[in-house]
């Protein structure tokens, strides 16, 4: 069963973490649905974003972080390892000095921290995908 | 209730047709949701475009047409009478020449006929919002 | 094995200008940001300026602000100051060094060069 | 006045444990980085990401972070180690800022 968009959850991250999305974009890549990833700093969607990652299904990714209201230098990628109509996994992995993206199992994408991900306290993910699974699995200690 | 969103609606168009929206965008304006409004010359998503109207709410407003499968001049505009957190009522209208967009009873953008508006046969309204209404009226013959 | 070495300073009146340059060579010099920091005399370190790999982004502290122009050539592998407008207190040993990201800091310094500005 | 604060001086007996601290309200959210720097020298970076040590440094460096307190420790502390010690950290990602420095003495 579908899960609402957007989607908010409370999430507590550290090294070890990893956050599970499985979804499907709503339309066809020539119309450049949007995925949207934001680990944020508070349960409030307007609170600052530790990592924002936005797919534009077909055409790019783009990562960055938003302090103190203020979005600082994007990183941006090509690989594109998404299908068009097809449904995605993706996992976000917390390791030491960054994010790890992987996409259907394969690694694509990294972030180096900017902002300890300690400070995350929500997790949203939005835009142009229907959404069948949200999992945050904490490294057990 | 709510409509849909992704919405689809087969349509016909021509002078004195007026598409009527109402919705409010499902994230704060500093997070940059998006309105699309996709008027198609078929049924299919993939179809060709002879209106395309995005709202990117807070920043922008940009107008295009998809001929043959491709882009062409983009019309961009700053002006943004939409509100943050919100309700809009979004109307276009085909006027002889070109689409009149109003917002709020507004006029506030326009979009001169690139392609004829009778090609138009569905309207897809979609991105970030929910929606409320959807409308197409004809002109009494 | 990896070198950054500032040049440029020397003495200079006040309201006048001095352009550093910082030369770099053993690792890709376009994959990282780099950053000026000065140390005026008996005191401590203070960032000054900041660059992205591409040059397409620059930072600059408030007491520069305006003044000091941050620029980069990548097929140089080389780093610029451009500090105009100068003051007394801009006086200090200009310091280069590189940073791949917020969580690693600047894990290379050039030996930097001393500026000096007399009224 | 700088966002970080640190102390001015700290002394230790040689072979002894050494502390340095540094405090400043955006330690809980940015990552604190330590450098030595010795007289007419270049700074060193010694802990990188709030305890990381880069290569080359000696063991008995470590760092450590803790709401809005990044601690620099020296375990054993020897002769070689008297210098200036600075932390770094952020006023956002994009703009460092440096304590004002602790003058480490080592009897």
């Known amino acids: 069963s579908l899960l609402p968009v957007p989607y908010t959850e409370a999430a507590s991250l550290s090294t070890g973490s990893t956050v599970t999305i499985k979804g499907r974009p709503l339309a066809c890549f020539l119309n450049e649905p949007y995925l949207q990833v934001d680990f944020h700093t508070e349960m409030k969607e307007e609170s600052d974003i530790v990592f924002h990652f936005q797919v534009c299904f077909g055409r790019r990714v783009v990562m960055n972080s938003r302090e103190y209201g203020a979005w600082k230098q994007q990183v941006e990628s090509k690989n594109m390892p998404f299908q068009d109509g097809q449904e995605f996994e993706l996992s976000i992995s917390v390791l030491p000095d960054k994010y790890q993206v992987m996409v259907n199992g394969q690694s694509s994408y990294t972030f180096d921290h900017r902002i300890k991900p300690e400070a995350v306290k929500m997790v949203q993910v939005w835009r142009d995908i229907s959404l069948t699974k949200f999992n945050v699995s904490y490294l057990k200690r | 209730s709510l409509l849909p969103v992704p919405y689809t609606e087969a349509a016909s168009l021509s002078t004195g047709s007026t598409v009527t929206i109402k919705g409010r965008p499902l994230a704060c304006f500093l997070n940059e949701p998006y309105l699309q409004v996709d008027f198609h010359t078929e049924m299919k998503e993939e179809s060709d475009i002879v209106f395309h109207f995005q709202v990117c709410f807070g920043r922008r407003v940009v107008m295009n047409s998809r001929e043959y499968g491709a882009w062409k001049q983009q019309v961009e505009s700053k002006n943004m009478p939409f509100q943050d957190g919100q309700e809009f009522e979004l109307s276009i209208s085909v006027l002889p020449d070109k689409y009149q967009v109003m917002v709020n009873g507004q006029s506030s953008y326009t979009f001169d006929h690139r392609i004829k508006p009778e090609a138009v046969k569905m309207v897809q309204v979609w991105r970030d919002i929910s929606l409320t209404k959807f409308n197409v009226s004809y002109l009494k013959r | 094995q990896l070198q950054v070495v500032e040049s440029g300073g020397g003495l200079v009146q006040t309201g006048g200008s001095l352009t550093l340059s910082c030369t770099t060579s053993g690792f890709t010099f376009s994959r990282y940001w780099m950053i000026w920091v000065r140390q005026a005399p008996g005191k401590g370190l203070e960032w000054v300026s900041s660059i992205y790999n591409d040059g397409g982004n620059t930072y600059y502290a408030d007491s520069v602000k305006g003044r000091f122009t941050i620029s980069r050539d990548n097929s140089e592998n080389t780093l610029y100051l451009q500090m105009n407008s100068l003051k007394s207190e801009d006086t200090a040993v200009y310091y280069c060094a590189k940073l791949k990201a917020a969580y690693y800091g600047m894990d290379y310094w050039g030996k930097g060069t001393l500026v000096t500005v007399s009224s | 006045s700088s966002a970080l604060t640190q102390p001015s001086a700290v002394s230790v007996s040689l072979g002894q444990t050494a502390r340095i601290t540094c405090q400043g309200a955006n330690l809980g959210r940015y990552y604190g980085i330590w450098y030595q720097q010795k007289p007419g020298q270049a700074p060193v970076q010694v802990i990188y990401g709030d305890s990381n040590r880069p290569s080359g440094i000696p063991e008995r460096f470590s760092g450590s972070s803790s709401g809005g307190t990044a601690t620099l420790t020296i375990s054993g502390a020897q002769a070689e180690d008297e210098a200036d010690y600075y932390c770094?950290?952020?006023?956002?990602?994009?703009?460092?800022?440096f304590g004002g420095g602790t003058h480490l003495t080592v009897l």
């Open positions: 770094q950290s952020y006023e956002s990602s994009t703009s460092p800022v």
